[in-house]
Interface confidence: medium
């Protein structure tokens, strides 16, 4: 019967010749009267058998990534007779891995948004790094994932490429921050390889900013000519938030007189100030009333950031007008 | 004749308080909005508070919200400031000024009393 | 807040010679609301020019102010011997704010 250790060669060998084992049959008793030969893909220019021995070499570097195994045919012929002396037979050569891969990010480039303000823990986005090196041989495909950029907001679940968030982030302060994670095989150890991604992490806007006021005094004119319903003039609050976040309704907080009131432009969301009722210069020369800005859509869970609506105060002064 | 004239000024020491006052002779006190105004050693102008004629309304710059108070007597034609938790850059002269009946801008002034505030 | 910058800081001129001031403002300001006060030393400003443009009671016509927009001027076309003094604009459409003033001086 034929005679063999299961046949392994490393990959990435540069000698010119490496021996990988030995095929015999046991009727082979040594005095070179047997002859071995190697057929199938591979033989005579990958492998090669000793025909006297029945040793056998590769004689080419081995990509493992490329090709893990070969299967070749052996024959064993009697030099005399010319006649086999075993039946043919199939067998193995299995590649063994080297650690010669790094990991790769495939899906990238990789973008998430997440909302600002989101709790520490929130998940982000999970990035996953690829080996081709054999994951059942040791630890060359085994990954970890670590932060290289983007401390303190963001952390990384070493085994899973899960991005969370570590600390608040304000979108007003900074609305996108570019995350670096490596992932390393070798579990880390050394020797390892490693490849990089960069993660763009937007942040949405939420409704935690209240509109203020751009000024906390107004000065306004009317002549007493005016007509009730004239626009006598505009105020204007800022909001950091964007969008609907930032839409806005003014009023009158505190008009003692009645004379005057606020409609909300909400295309350029200023506050326009209009004559309710006409004014006279000889009865009253100046008017004060106090306005207040609000947005418009809150969410009950972010009512914290609006309480105290930001107020101004408008002094409006009555021009006179020469009566006939 | 038409005047203002400031009073009450001196020396304090930082966190102390001072009570200005202003007497306006001349005209219709009542009928008019009044400020005080400041100038530090060397320095330019700072407006710090408005009162309504009627003592309605009240405004105050940043520099002094929530420490200094801008009262008025109608009866008795005067004008005060209040300061409290007074700092070492409220040192200056503290003027009074009349704003018009048809703008807000001050047409008439006091001499001004001055106000140092040091330890 | 709107910031009033004037220039120049110290004009040196002599009696007789034209002083022209400038008065720039951060963001627009209505020529409604701006006005120009005298300071001579050891006495409270007096009210020169309200308005942009408009001369206050009892001050001479050689005195006179214009602008609009963001740039004012203040113009004394012949100085006196009374009219060496620091000058100051000021906004009154939004708070009040003053520029940090120009001293005309004697050459």
């Known amino acids: 019967g034929w005679v063999w250790n299961q046949f392994f060669v490393p990959e990435e060998m540069n000698t010119t010749s490496h021996h990988i084992g030995q095929l015999r049959s046991d009727l082979d008793n040594g005095n070179n009267s047997f002859q071995y030969k190697l057929l199938g893909a591979g033989a005579g220019s990958t492998f090669i058998i000793d025909e006297r021995t029945g040793d056998i070499y590769a004689i080419q570097k081995l990509d493992r990534e490329e090709r893990s195994l070969y299967i070749l045919r052996a024959q064993v012929i009697d030099i005399a007779t010319g006649r086999a002396v075993e039946p043919e037979s199939e067998f193995v050569i299995k590649v063994s891995d080297i650690n010669d891969n790094e990991p790769k990010f495939l899906d990238e480039p990789y973008e998430a948004i997440v909302p600002e303000m989101s709790p520490e823990g929130t998940l982000v986005i999970q990035v996953t790094a690829s080996d081709a090196d054999d994951p059942s041989s040791g630890n060359n495909a085994r990954l970890l994932y670590s932060l290289l950029q983007g401390q303190p907001y963001f952390s990384v679940e070493p085994t899973t490429g899960v991005i969370r968030i570590s600390s608040k982030m304000d979108r007003e302060l900074q609305d996108e921050y570019w995350v670096i994670i490596q992932a390393k095989d070798m579990i880390g150890q050394p020797g390892a390889l490693s490849g990089t991604t960069s993660v763009l992490i937007k942040l949405s806007d939420v409704n935690d900013n209240k509109p203020i006021f751009k000024e906390s005094l107004y000065r306004l004119t009317v002549s007493e000519s005016a007509p009730t319903g004239t626009s006598i003039g505009t105020i204007m609050a800022y909001d950091n938030d964007i969008g609907e976040n930032a839409e806005m309704d003014y009023s009158i907080e505190e008009d003692d007189s009645q004379t005057f009131d606020i409609i909300t432009n909400h295309e350029t969301q200023e506050g326009i100030v209009i004559l309710k009722k006409k004014v006279d210069f000889e009865h009253q020369n100046h008017y004060g009333i106090r306005a207040k800005v609000k947005n418009h859509h809150v969410p009950e869970q972010l009512m914290k950031y609006h309480t105290e609506a930001s107020t101004t105060f408008i002094k409006i002064q009555v021009e006179d007008v020469d009566e006939p | 004749q038409v005047q203002l004239v400031e009073s009450g000024g001196g020396v304090v020491q930082p966190g102390g308080s001072l009570r200005l006052s202003c007497a306006a002779s001349?005209?219709?006190?009542?009928?008019?909005?009044m400020d005080w105004v400041r100038q530090a050693p060397g320095k330019g102008l700072e407006w710090v508070a408005v009162i309504w004629y009627d003592g309605s309304n009240k405004y105050y710059a940043d520099s002094v919200r929530g420490r200094f108070t801008i009262s008025r007597d109608n009866s008795k034609n005067t004008l005060f400031l209040q300061m409290n938790s007074l700092r070492v850059e409220d040192t200056a002269v503290y003027y009074c000024?009349?704003?018009?009946?048809?703008?807000?801008?001050?047409?008439?002034w006091g001499r001004g009393t001055l106000v140092t505030v040091s330890s | 807040e709107i910031v009033l910058t004037q220039s120049p800081g110290t004009l040196s001129l002599s009696p007789g010679e034209r002083a022209t001031l400038s008065c720039r403002a951060s963001?627009?300001?209505?020529?409604?609301?701006l006005a120009w006060y005298q300071q001579r030393p050891g006495q409270a400003p007096r009210l020169l020019i309200y308005g942009a443009s408009s001369r206050a009671t009892g001050i001479p016509d050689r005195f006179s102010g214009s602008g609009s927009g963001t740039d004012f001027t203040l113009t004394i076309s012949s100085l006196e011997p009374e009219d060496f003094a620091v000058y100051y604009c000021?906004?009154?459409?939004?708070?009040?704010?003053f520029g940090q003033g120009t001293k005309v001086e004697i050459k």
């Open positions: 000021q906004q009154y459409g939004s708070s009040w704010t």
């Open positions: 001349g005209f219709s006190f009542s009928s008019y909005d």
């Open positions: 000024a009349r704003e018009t009946g048809e703008g807000w801008y001050f047409d008439l």
């Open positions: 963001q627009s300001v209505s020529s409604s609301y």
